[in-house]
Interface confidence: low
């Protein structure tokens, strides 16, 4: 009599979550009779899977018609699939007694349930920190089995070092999530920096998920400021420059000064950038020297995104100049189109 | 018939120890997941712990380094080793089996009272 | 962990009456959740397993459906017997946990 084989074609299938795997059987004999039944795992604690003779398996479907004698197929349809799933399943026969006795059990078949982790999303500081500041970032990905996964971190194509990562839950789960904290020092140039969280995962075909964060949202640059006193013009005008560079982001308020008061108020707006993507703005005020007796203090107060003002103070001489008898203005624009310069300077 | 039964439940001490003991009937009890539920008087289920076929065991966060859950297969038997008992742990024990395809809850035993007061 | 919530805590209703008590997983718990009925001064019994399969010997007017995070359990004709309190309880990871409880109540 020939032997009886329980045979399991495929070693290994692999299905993704939510889809149904399809686990192949054949026995070569019907003889002797008795139930085939489904393990996952192997040993005393295996887990009943299916039992063709017998209980509820909401889950589990036979591929072939159990209940015809000629049936040969004892393949299974499990639905549904998560990654509670994954094992290997063993295909058993057994002769019908009490209790049934275990004849021959197939070489199993491993299910592996691939999960795809969703899209990293990448996040950075509530509030702007300046240069030679560590500033952390955090991703987050969701959703993936198995637990087995790899994240990188990146800032203009480096990749970074300083960086944690957890992946939760520690124990076995349905599926896994991962969050990463990356620290990163802040430079002047960095307006235009990127941060790049990259996930590998079996699921992913070697084709990473990545999130990304511009480090402009993080980056506050200061501005260098510069006042400077152009030469005398023949109307006893002094053309005096508050030069305000390498400012991010460009939300900048200026104020000039005449002797302690506001002389004029200006917003910067639709600056044009810096290769670096900062911005520089420069504004003048002309002084009538004739108006004035004494020399005059003249401060370029400068207030950039909501931080403390900065000034810088210049004081004009007019002790050498002849005095214009009968005028009495302080100081003079010289219309709203001269009030600013941009600086071209990159 | 398949059956759990429950014992060893009682009036102990706060800080004392008891053990309680399930025996099954019916089934083999290594080839189930098996739980303990508790119900305090008047209040809803909780569960308590849980071991596996492989002898994997899990425990709820305020009973871990104080409960130990164990079975003989010999004797067909869980049990529940209760140490540092607390009067939040005053409750009705049930012992649980899970079921052989995915852990539901099938078969419960009628369930031991533990009352921890001095 | 996951947190499980029934409502309503409890309802009246009469005999013959259809009811529905819902339950709600903070997380997606895909389908396994049981609902399990106890009467004063007994054991929980179980109805329902993988949200929608009776346990065997259940009688078919206890019905449950639901996946994901949302469930329910309906009672069709509610007779005399029916009248206890009911418990949903998620069962895809460890800490298992249960409901509140909605207690069923003759009007």
């Known amino acids: 009599e020939e032997e009886l084989q329980v045979i399991q074609p495929e070693k290994s299938v692999s299905v993704a979550a939510g889809d149904s795997a399809t686990l192949n059987c054949t026995v070569s004999s019907l003889i002797p009779v008795g139930p085939i039944q489904w393990f996952r795992g192997a040993g005393p604690g295996r887990e009943l899977i299916y039992n063709l003779k017998e209980g509820h398996f909401p889950r589990v479907t036979p591929v072939s018609d159990p209940t015809k004698r000629n049936n040969m197929d004892f393949s299974i349809r499990i639905s549904n699939i998560t990654p509670a799933d994954a094992g290997t399943y063993y295909c058993v026969k057994f002769r019908k007694g009490s209790p049934d006795v275990e004849l021959k059990s197939g070489a199993g078949t491993e299910l592996s349930v691939r999960a795809k982790p969703s899209a990293p999303v990448v996040s950075g500081p509530a509030v702007r920190a300046t240069a030679e500041h560590t500033v952390s970032f955090t991703c987050e990905s969701h959703g993936f089995s198995p637990r087995d996964i790899t994240l990188k971190w990146f800032k203009n194509g480096n990749e970074l070092s300083d960086f944690q990562t957890n992946v939760d839950p520690a124990g076995k789960s349905v599926s896994y999530s991962i969050r990463s904290t990356a620290r990163v020092v802040l430079t002047r140039r960095d307006v235009h920096s990127q941060v790049i969280c990259e996930v590998a995962h079996v699921t992913l075909q070697g084709d990473p998920l990545r999130g990304t964060a511009n480090l402009s949202e993080a980056i506050r640059v200061p501005p260098f400021l510069e006042v400077t006193q152009q030469s005398m013009r023949a109307d006893n005008q002094v053309n005096v420059t508050c030069q305000v560079t390498k400012f991010y982001p460009q939300r900048l308020q200026l104020t000039w000064l005449e002797n302690g008061n506001v002389s004029r108020t200006e917003m910067a707006s639709a600056l044009p950038e810096n290769k670096d993507g900062t911005y520089n703005w420069t504004s003048w005020l002309l002084v009538n020297v004739s108006a004035h007796r004494d020399d005059v203090k003249l401060t370029c107060q400068v207030e950039h995104d909501g931080q403390p003002a900065v000034n810088k103070s210049f004081s004009v001489k007019v002790s050498a100049h002849p005095k214009e008898q009968g005028s009495n203005t302080a100081a003079e624009n010289t219309g709203t189109n001269e009030r600013n310069i941009y600086g071209g300077s990159g | 018939e398949v059956q759990l039964v429950e014992s060893g439940g009682g009036l102990v001490q706060p800080g004392g120890s008891l053990r309680l003991s399930c025996a099954a009937s019916?089934?083999?009890?290594?080839?189930?997941?098996m739980h303990w539920v508790r119900q305090a008087p008047g209040k809803g289920l909780e569960w308590v712990s849980a071991?596996?076929?492989?002898?994997?065991?899990y425990y709820t966060g305020s009973v871990k380094g104080r409960f130990t859950i164990s079975r003989e297969n010999a004797k067909n038997s869980l049990y529940l080793q209760m140490n540092s008992l607390r009067a939040a742990d005053t409750a009705v024990y049930y012992c649980?089996?899970?079921?052989?395809?995915?852990?539901?809850?099938?078969?419960w035993g009628q369930g031991t009272m533990v009352t921890v007061s001095s | 962990d996951i947190q499980m919530t029934q409502s309503p805590s409890s309802l009246s209703a009469s005999v013959g009456d259809r009811v529905t008590i819902t339950c709600r997983a903070s997380?997606?718990?895909?389908?396994?959740l049981a609902w399990f009925q106890q009467k004063p001064g007994k054991a929980p019994k179980s109805l329902i397993y993988?949200?929608?399969s009776l346990h065997s010997g259940v009688p078919s007017k206890f019905s449950g459906s639901g996946s994901g995070t949302d469930f329910t359990l309906t009672i069709s004709s509610l007779q005399p017997e029916d009248f206890a309190t009911y418990y949903c309880?998620?069962?895809?990871?460890?800490?298992?946990?249960f409901g509140q409880g909605t207690k069923l109540e003759i009007k």
């Open positions: 309880q998620q069962y895809v990871s460890y800490p298992y946990t």
């Open positions: 649980v089996r899970g079921g052989v395809w995915d852990d539901a809850f099938d078969i």
């Open positions: 993988t949200a929608s």
């Open positions: 071991i596996g076929t492989a002898g994997d065991t």
């Open positions: 997380q997606d718990i895909n389908n396994y």
């Open positions: 019916g089934f083999t009890l290594s080839s189930y997941d």
